[in-house]
Amino acid sequence: SLLPVPYTEAASLSTGSTVTIKGRPLACFLNEPYLQVDFHTEMKEESDIVFHFQVCFGRRVVMNSREYGAWKQQVESKNMPFQDGQEFELSISVLPDKYQVMVNGQSSYTFDHRIKPEAVKMVQVWRDISLTKFNVSYLKR
Amino acid sequence: SLLPVPYTEAASLSTGSTVTIKGRPLACFLNEPYLQVDFHTEMKEESDIVFHFQVCFGRRVVMNSREYGAWKQQVESKNMPFQDGQEFELSISVLPDKYQVMVNGQSSYTFDHRIKPEAVKMVQVWRDISLTKFNVSYLKR
């Protein structure tokens, strides 16, 4: 069954945590649907963003942070492991120094920590996708 | 009650026709939600687009056409009559020489015809909005 989109969930992250998302683009890649995953510092959607991950399917991925309301230096990748019309599984792992983004089991993107992952309080998944799975796994202490 | 998004409806347009859309952005303007309305030449979403109208709420509007699979010269406007968090009523009227876009009763954008409006067979409304009304009115002959 489908999860609502935008999908928002409270989350606490630290090294070892992984966020897993399963979904499907709502349009063909020719029409450039988007997927966005934002790690927020508060439960409010206007809050700062520790890690912003935006896919323009078929074109590019941009990653960034939003600090005190201002977007910082954007990181762009043309790597496009997503398949037109196909379901995807996205996992974002918190490594000691960066986020590692896997797409369908394949390491696809990294983003160096600018803000501590411990500052994350909420994850939002949204834009032009249907969502079937959202999970945050925590490293067993 | 809400209409599904993406929302797709068969439509025949000519001078005097008006497409009316009521909806609301799904996110605050800080997060740059989008609204897109596309007038397609076929019932298929991969088909050419006679009139492409995309709002990046709080930032800008772009208009274009997609002909034989290729995007043409983009027209951009910084005019932003949409209100953060507020419902909007959008009406697109087919004039003899152009499309006229009204936002909340105020003439806000125009786009000269590149392809005859009679080539339109389908209208799609999508991206980051909830949709409460979609109507195509035809001029009585």
Epitope: T41, S65, E67, Y68, A70, K72, Q73, V75, D97, D112, H113, R114, I115, K116, E118, A119 | -
Partner: antibody, heavy 124, light 107 residues
Framework: ELQLVESGGGLVQPGGSLRLSCAAS????????MSWVRQAPGKGLEWVSN????????GYADSVKGRFTISRDNAKNTLYLQMNSLKPEDMAVYYC?????????????????WGKGTLVTVSS | QAVLTQPSAVSVSLGQTARITCQGG??????ASWYQQKPGQAPVLVIY???ERPSGIPERFSGSSSGDTATLTISGAQAEDEADYYC??????????FGGGTHLTGL
């Protein structure tokens, strides 16, 4: 061996201008963000400005905004700081520094290599 | 005026543990870096991302942070560790700010 060598310092009158240069060698200069940090005589370190690897994005401390301009020439492996409307309080040793690992400035990783500095004296 | 507050001096005996604090930063959000500066020399990065050591920095240097305070710890301080130490964090990730500096003495 990685080296950063600053030059262009000297004596200038208040209201005057100076252009500092930092010649980089021993690493792929065009891949790293760079920064200018200054230290007034007997005082602590003060961040002045930074620039991303391509030169398209810059940042400035409030104390120098509108007066100083950072730039770089990746073909010449050189970082610059154009200083205008100099004030007595701008008098300091100016260091150029390389960010540890990213092409954009990221304070999380610090600055891992510094030049020896060049002294700017502002006096009438 | 430094936004990050450090003690102006910390005294430690040879072989003992020195702790230098840095207060006033948003260390719940931003990481701390630490620099060592000896007279007439350029600063040297000794800790970044709160607790990471660059290659070539002795293991006796360690770092931590909690709340509004970051701490540099030198376990078994050596004579060559006598120097000024500066903490650095971010007003934002791309905007560095330094503490006022701490002189480590007694060695």
């Amino acid at each position: 061996e990685l080296q950063l060598v600053e030059s262009g310092g000297g004596l200038v009158q208040p209201g005057g201008s100076l252009r500092l240069s930092c010649a980089a060698s021993g690493f792929t200069f065009s891949s790293y963000a760079m920064s200018w940090v200054r230290q007034a005589p007997g005082k602590g370190l003060e961040w002045v400005s930074n620039i991303n690897s391509g030169g398209g994005s810059t940042g400035y401390a409030d104390s120098v905004k509108g007066r100083f301009t950072i730039s770089r020439d990746n073909a010449k492996n050189t970082l610059y700081l154009q200083m205008n409307s100099l004030k007595p309080e701008d008098m300091a040793v100016y260091y150029c520094a390389k960010y540890l690992r990213t092409y954009y400035p990221n304070a999380a990783f610090g600055m891992d290599y510094w030049g020896k500095g060049t002294l700017v004296t502002v006096s009438s | 005026q430094a936004v990050l507050t450090q003690p102006s001096a910390v005294s430690v005996s040879l072989g003992q543990t020195a702790r230098i604090t840095c207060q006033g930063g948003n260390f719940g959000r931003y990481y701390a870096s630490w620099y060592q500066q000896k007279p007439g020399q350029a600063p040297v990065l000794v800790i970044y991302r709160d607790s990471e050591r660059p290659s070539g920095i002795p293991e006796r240097f360690s770092g931590s942070s909690s709340g509004d305070t970051a701490t540099l710890t030198i376990s078994g301080a050596q004579a060559e560790d006598e120097a000024d130490y500066y903490c650095q964090s971010g007003r934002s990730s791309d905007n560095a700010v330094f503490g006022g500096g701490t002189h480590l003495t007694g060695l």
